[in-house]
């Protein structure tokens, strides 16, 4: 059962895994659900009557029964981790610490004119797990100004202490803030020979590299796969980091394969969410349960709906044998991770689900698409929304993405004439404009959040987000997309699609179905030359042919520009301007998603 | 509620600068755009220019080099000031604000009356 | 810049009847876009401009129906269908397409 709350001076006796340091309750509850382990938790906040050694002290706790007896205790905080809750779950913790000193190996020491630059700086360096900055009012004047990087192997303070004009806080790599490139290649026959902080077992390299991901000292890995020569080491996944944060030395090794972390990737590919079977694999591990079970199918469910298993091994039914069922081995260990990984004995192995909840929804699988054809299939666009106007008589306005679950994200122009967010009706998980009816179900707008520097489509900034008065369900039908990573600047994509229900031709009507285009993107200089009257800056993307004939046109303006890269469909570009509609040698203008990440995140992010 | 109300002299002498100010209430002048507009009497209404909620201006080619625009978002007031007026000049003088976008004109201040005049 | 040229320049009609007031730009309207940034403003004796119409045909909230917008790139057109007698004043188009905006030269109303 999910439980949020905190529980005041209570704490939790016993079921000790181990201690670490957190600047709040509220943090000690994350760390805890990011524990292979961890379901509950007891925190100690400062208190004169407590020692301060122990002030900050966040002890990481197991049970069986998934519970532990209570005991009052002044300035104990205490709590249940997240797994237990169906709810997303983020990392990201943008909290500043005023007069703490969070302690950890001070790396990199420099000048910064504020505390926000110095989180910057840490959320940019590959190392840096959190900071503590001497503020202008701080006695000692050599250290007034001083921004301190700091790493420790947890990714948590080795110790808490109170210090007076400090300020402390955490990378923001986790919000999808850092600048840092997203390395997605996975290099095979590749060994990288650098130190080794960990190793774990893991089926493929895949899952190795989403191992090194949410581990905190990891930047890169090596995997050796289930060939390598030497048996003792298949399936050994090693977790590396190097003083430069990139491999020094990369050496040519048969059926081994080698890849980064996926730190500045992670709000766009799954890096929790271990959801592939491993056929004739047994993963070996601490036993939780054996349960009769259908298929490997439902072992996995069985798996995801029991909190304390990490992963498990389905060995198929004898013929017959027990009405069609087979044993379901549900299995735990220290790391989440398999102690061992064996081949050959018949077994169907697989991870729990529950941590899929970590992971962005946008980076869910969606149905295989009907390629060709103009029109869409239902569920194929399922981040698409149409916005609508109620004034003065309903009808559809614009288009738009679907990117948290109370946040749409389109174009400013959308809402020339609209004085206010009560006419706007967002109707999600719709193919044809006609099934809205006057009883079809839609999300009311509480606010409309225009970028401040908008001011024509032609001049840029052409961006807005419509906030929600309910949240969105997310169903097959209506999903949200992933923002591009700021980390994937320099990706080309290939598989480029607008989507909408606008105009057709320039002189006709909105289109009753959802129509699909696919668009290659065309580049900003490229671009400069097709619109030589017009500044298509960087804050743009072009897509179309040479030979036009394939556009945006009105009506589809504040829709997807989706490119689906790796897997995973990303929201590249907002339908923004254009000189006609798919003319010769004149490209559509969208919005440029990836330089306003920064900017969406802080106005979706805001308490 | 939203309410506009231009103030200044009703008076002013040819050659002289115009300062007229229009205080705003109900919004904030970082959320919504400003524009100023004036009507000489028994004629036709003439845009002069905006302050754009990001603090940027822009004017009317005819008047650009006559006119600035600023605001001291504080006091939720934008200021017109005209070089060189000219009997010509006469005029209401009316701020406007536009809804979401820069337009349309949703709401008007009542307009004021400035006679140039030696 | 661009010029509105409104025609006619005044004209008076019995109420009930229909009213019509054209609004040709030197320049098409139409923004790259896909709006149409053509507004039409009425101003009653004494009183300042008040918004009918934005982008070209969509009537502002509490404007009567009688009142309708048309017209694409250059040409619009103003429709009141049955005048009445509160309709007096005068009718002024507005572009805000292109920097700097302009309005036309104004259309007055009277009413026989």
């Known amino acids: 059962e999910c439980v949020t709350q905190l529980l005041k001076d209570t704490c939790f006796e016993g079921g000790d895994i181990t201690t670490v340091f957190t600047p709040s309750a509220k943090y000690c509850q994350v760390v805890c659900t990011y524990h292979p382990r961890c379901l509950l938790f007891t925190f100690t906040a400062e208190s004169p009557s407590e020692d301060p050694t122990r002030w900050f002290t966040c002890v990481l706790k197991d049970s069986v029964t998934e519970t532990l007896p209570r005991v009052n205790r002044t300035a104990a905080i205490s709590g249940y981790s997240f797994k237990q809750c169906s709810h997303q779950i983020s990392a990201c913790n943008k909290d500043i610490y005023v007069d703490l000193d969070m302690k950890g190996i001070n790396y990199n020491s420099s000048v910064a004119k504020s505390a926000q630059e110095c989180q910057e700086r840490c959320t940019d360096d590959v190392h840096c797990h959190f900071f503590t900055y001497a503020t202008r009012q701080f006695p000692s004047l050599e250290h007034r100004n001083i921004c301190l990087l700091k790493h420790t192997q947890t990714g948590t303070p080795t110790r808490i202490t109170k210090l007076d004009k400090v300020v402390s806080g955490f990378s923001l790599k986790s919000c999808a803030l850092s600048n840092l490139a997203c390395i997605r290649d996975i290099f095979p026959n590749t060994v990288f020979a650098d130190s080794n902080i960990d190793s774990v077992m893991a089926p493929d390299a895949f899952v190795c590299g989403r191992i090194c991901t949410h581990h905190p000292g990891c930047l890169f890995f090596t995997f050796f796969s289930q060939e390598w020569p030497k048996e003792s080491q298949r399936n050994l996944c090693l977790l590396k980091t190097s003083e430069s944060g990139l491999p020094s030395t990369r050496i040519k090794k048969s059926k081994a394969l080698s890849g980064f972390s996926l730190q500045s990737c992670r709000h766009s590919i799954p890096v929790f969410c271990h959801s592939s079977f491993y056929h004739d694999t047994d993963f070996l591990g601490e036993e939780l349960d054996i349960v009769a079970a259908k298929s490997h199918e439902a072992c996995q469910k069985l798996c995801t709906n029991a909190v304390r298993c990490q992963f498990f091994t389905y060995t198929p039914a004898q013929a017959s044998c027990n009405e069609g069922k087979g044993k379901c081995y549900l299995k735990l260990s220290s790391n989440g991770s398999p102690t061992k990984i064996l081949h050959g004995r018949g077994g169907i192995s697989g991870y729990t689900l529950r941590l899929c909840k970590m992971d962005n929804e946008c980076t869910t699988k969606i149905k295989p698409r009907i390629v060709g054809g103009t029109a869409s299939v239902r569920g194929e666009w399922p981040w698409q929304v149409t916005l609508h106007t109620t004034s003065p008589t309903q009808r559809h306005l614009c288009g738009g993405s679907i990117i948290g679950n109370q946040w749409i994200l389109t174009a400013a122009h959308c809402f020339y004439g609209v004085e206010s967010p009560k006419i706007l009706r967002v109707y999600s998980g719709i193919l044809n404009q006609s099934e809205i009816k006057e009883d079809t179900s839609f999300f009311g707008v509480q606010e409309i959040i225009i970028h401040d520097q908008y001011k024509m489509a032609e001049s840029g900034y052409d961006i807005a987000l419509l906030k929600l008065e309910t949240t969105v369900n997310y169903t097959d039908s209506q999903r949200p997309i992933c923002l591009p990573s700021k980390g994937d600047r320099n990706v080309i994509y290939t598989d480029c699609w607008v989507t909408g229900w606008g105009y057709r031709k320039l002189r006709d009507k909105i289109q009753n179905t959802l129509q699909k285009a696919k668009i290659p993107l065309v580049t900003n200089e490229e671009c400069q030359k097709r619109y030589r009257g017009h500044k298509i800056t960087h804050k743009m993307i072009c897509a179309g042919y040479r030979e036009g004939g394939k556009d945006a046109c009105k009506g589809d303006s504040g829709g997807p520009l989706s490119c689906k890269h790796n897997e995973v469909w990303h929201l590249v570009g907002i339908t923004s301007w254009g000189e006609g509609c798919a003319q010769r040698e004149r490209p559509g203008v969208y919005t440029n998603v990836v330089e306003y990440v920064d900017w969406i995140l802080e106005k979706t992010q805001a308490v | 509620q939203v309410t506009l109300k231009e103030s200044g002299p009703v008076l002013v002498k040819p050659t002289e600068t115009l300062t007229l100010t229009c205080t705003v209430s109900g919004f904030s002048l970082t959320s919504y755009h400003l524009h100023w507009i004036r009507q000489p009497p028994g004629k036709a209404l003439e845009w002069m220019g905006l302050?754009?909620?990001?603090?940027?201006?822009s004017y009317n080619s005819r008047l650009k080099s006559r006119l600035t625009i600023s605001r001291d978002t504080s006091k939720s007031q934008v200021v017109l000031t005209m070089t060189n007026m000219d009997p010509v000049d006469t005029a209401t003088y009316y701020c406007?604000?536009?809804?979401?976008?820069?337009?349309?004109?949703?709401?008007w201040g009542q307009g004021t009356l400035v006679t140039v005049s030696s | 810049d661009v010029v509105l040229t409104q025609t006619p320049l005044s004209l008076s009609v019995t109420p009930g009847q229909p009213a019509s007031i054209s609004c040709r730009s030197s320049?098409?309207?139409?923004?790259?876009?896909?709006?149409?940034?053509l507004e039409w403003y009425l101003q009653k004796p004494g009183q300042s401009p008040q918004l009918l119409i934005y982008g070209v045909s969509n009537r502002f909230s509490g404007v009567p129906d009688r009142f309708s917008g048309s017209g694409s790139g250059t040409d619009f057109t103003l429709k009141i269908s049955r005048v009445e007698a509160e309709d007096l004043g005068v009718y002024y188009c507005f572009q805000a397409t292109r920097d700097p905006f302009t309005f036309g030269q104004g259309t007055k109303l009277e009413i026989k």
């Open positions: 302050m754009w909620r990001d603090g940027d201006t």
């Open positions: 320049q098409s309207l139409e923004s790259s876009d896909g709006n149409t940034y």
């Open positions: 406007a604000r536009g809804m979401t976008l820069a337009t349309p004109f949703l709401y």
